[in-house]
């Protein structure tokens, strides 16, 4: 088979400057970005603005309450995870604008894209911890009265962060920069090369531990909680429960495309048409997953407005009302009763 029967293929327009006409892809298509990449850029921009400001506000609101209010500890840690991930966005944005050229070096390639995975694991483990907390409040109120304290909450968060770091290590280790010869471009990605089995193992572990198992346990957990709370007329408020259910639901909705494409790509040959198609959608899937980093503050504000009727209060006080609502009776009027039954409501503030 011979495909060399042409005269002058002139590759001159590809370079004459060090980073090339990076914008002229090999297939000689236009300089414009692909539609999925443009959508990803729009999402990244919105997520960065909302995520940085929103999560910074949540951190500010909850930081003051975190010493004494357990809910504040949960939401503070979630906001920190989201805020950290948002910090990587300008660099990911720049890379997509440059047609996935990565001029930031090997260290940045290992660390920055791993932040989103750290966020995923930290978020899901924190959500699991929060869900366990809600479950115990409903089903083991006496135990909560005796043992549920800020110290234990911080230990649970530390364990969640530690496990998240541990689960992020494989992706961190396999991230490399590859300088392609033509068109001259440096790419940042994972390279398992000889070890397709390990790539599949990492993808399966990520799907199971970061998605399926939490989905199953949280679904069971909240089904029981909702059944219990709806069966008890004594329950005054389910505000925190609604917020947490919304956060959990959004987590699974926005991570779904990333997880599905990730598992598919690990089982496909890199040269196959399906792999190449999914690879083109990769940035969009990542950006969709990144929505998680800004959605929580939005949920908190929406929840706050729902309970306030109108946005009469200042944003910080509205957030404070949602995020630091304790699951027990407090003297302060800013706290409302939660999903615990009447017996647990008699317990003192933690």
């Amino acid at each position: 088979m011979n495909s060399f029967n042409y005269t002058t293929p002139d590759y001159g327009h590809y370079d004459d400057k060090d980073t090339l006409d990076l914008n002229t892809p090999v297939d000689k298509t236009s300089n414009t970005l692909r539609v999925p990449d443009i959508l990803a850029l729009v999402i990244f921009a919105v997520v960065f603005l909302v995520g940085v400001l929103g999560n910074a506000l949540v951190v500010w609101v909850t930081a003051f309450e975190a010493k004494r209010t357990i809910n504040a500890i949960w939401f503070l840690n979630l906001a920190v995870a989201d805020f950290l991930s948002c910090l990587a966005l300008p660099i990911l944005f720049t890379s997509i604008v440059q047609h996935h050229h990565w001029p930031f070096g090997g260290a940045a390639c290992s660390i920055l894209p791993s932040l989103i995975l750290l966020n995923m694991y930290a978020s899901i483990l924190l959500l699991a911890t929060i869900s366990a907390d809600r479950f115990l409040l409903v089903f083991k109120p006496i135990w909560c009265q005796n043992f549920r304290g800020a110290g234990l909450a911080w230990i649970a968060c530390a364990v969640a962060w530690g496990l998240a770091l541990l689960l992020t290590i494989p992706s961190f280790l396999y991230r490399v920069v590859r300088e392609e010869y033509f068109p001259p471009k440096v790419l940042c990605g994972v390279d398992y090369s000889h070890d397709k089995r390990r790539e599949r193992a990492v993808a399966i572990v990520r799907l199971v531990l970061g998605f399926l198992w939490p989905l199953l346990t949280l679904t069971i957990c909240y089904t029981f909680i909702l059944l219990r709370t709806w069966s008890r007329r004594a329950t005054r408020s389910t505000k925190t429960l609604k917020v947490v259910v919304a956060v959990v639901a959004s987590f699974f909705i926005f991570w779904l495309p990333y997880q599905v494409t990730g598992i598919m790509m690990s089982f496909l040959e890199p040269s196959s048409p399906t792999f190449l198609l999914l690879n083109k959608l990769d940035s969009l899937c990542v950006s969709f997953a990144y929505i998680n980093c800004c959605i929580n503050p939005i949920i908190y504000v929406v929840a706050g407005q729902g309970f306030q009727g109108r946005l009469r209060k200042s944003l910080p006080s509205l957030l404070r009302n949602v995020l630091t609502e304790e699951s027990v009776v407090r003297e302060s009027k800013s706290f409302t009763r939660s999903t615990v039954d009447t017996m647990a409501q008699k317990t003192q503030a933690v």
Epitope: R178, E179, Y181, F182, P183, S271
Partner: antibody, heavy 121, light 112 residues
Framework: QVQLQQSGADLAKPGASVKLSCKAS????????IHWVKQRPGQGLEWIGY????????KYNQKFKDKATLTADRSSSTAYMQLSSLTYEDYAVYYC??????????????WGQGTTLTVSS | DVVMTQTPLSLPVSLGDQVSISCRSS???????????LQWYLQKPGQSPKLLIY???NRFSGVPDRFSGSGSGTDFTLKISRVEAEDLGVYFC?????????FGAGTKLELR
């Protein structure tokens, strides 16, 4: 027909510099990149770098960045490689090669006959 | 740098034999455009190398059909179905996906 005619064998002293040439004919010189490859006696091939004769854009293997300098003279359709600070390690056959490919300059389709560089005091 | 490991380094053959030469890369050679830029060259004694196979399995113009290439990702093979006298020499695999471009150490095909 396409031809890459390289300069004859060269003898140089350690520490000196040499300039090897590669004259192209039978095609439009500015339309194809010229690569340079090193082959030590009885050993494999090592890529040195390339030059795009149209705009004099060059790319080097890091290993040869301080050793080789690639240039091109469009008027005579000749590519040059200057090797500086010669050592005994530079004793080798040096090839120039033209690259081609439908999607980009990926394959060496035509090679020069090679220039043997001997480094001896 | 991508290390290209060829096996065997020496291959004694008889004319008419079918032979296989293996080439393994230290990194995946799949380009972001989906293609794999793996070439095979033959260098006969006292000559410059000649292109045989490009993009893993495509024969260059004028190359006999007894030469065939296969493989993907990191593992590649060159097969010669019936060795002829003109096939003797050193076979090099080469990649042009990543910078720097690299070559295998070579496999010497010689008569036993």
């Amino acid at each position: 027909q396409v031809q890459l005619q390289q300069s004859g064998a060269d003898l140089a002293k350690p520490g000196a510099s040499v300039k090897l040439s590669c004259k192209a004919s039978g095609y439009t010189f500015t339309s194809y990149w010229i690569h340079w490859v090193k082959q030590r006696p009885g050993q494999g091939l090592e890529w040195i770098g390339y030059i795009n004769p149209r705009g004099d854009y060059t790319k080097y293997n890091q290993k040869f960045k301080d050793k080789a300098t690639l240039t091109a003279d469009r008027s005579s359709s000749t590519a040059y490689m200057q090797l500086s600070s010669l050592t005994y390690e530079d004793y080798a056959v040096y090839y120039c090669a033209r690259v081609t490919g439908t999607e980009g300059p990926y394959y060496f389709d035509y090679w020069g006959q090679g220039t043997t560089l001997t480094v001896s005091s | 740098d991508v290390v290209m490991t060829q096996t065997p380094l020496s291959l004694p053959v008889s004319l008419g034999d079918q032979v296989s030469i293996s080439c393994r890369s230290s990194q995946s050679l799949v380009h972001s455009n989906g293609n794999t830029y793996l070439q095979w060259y033959l260098q006969k004694p006292g000559q410059s190398p000649k292109l045989l196979i490009y993009k893993v399995s495509n024969r260059f113009s004028g190359v006999p059909d007894r030469f065939s290439g296969s493989g993907s990702g990191t593992d590649f093979t060159l097969k010669i179905s019936r060795v002829e006298a003109e096939d003797l020499g050193v076979y090099f695999c080469s990649q042009s996906t990543l910078v720097p471009l690299t070559f295998g150490a070579g496999t010497k095909l010689e008569l036993r």
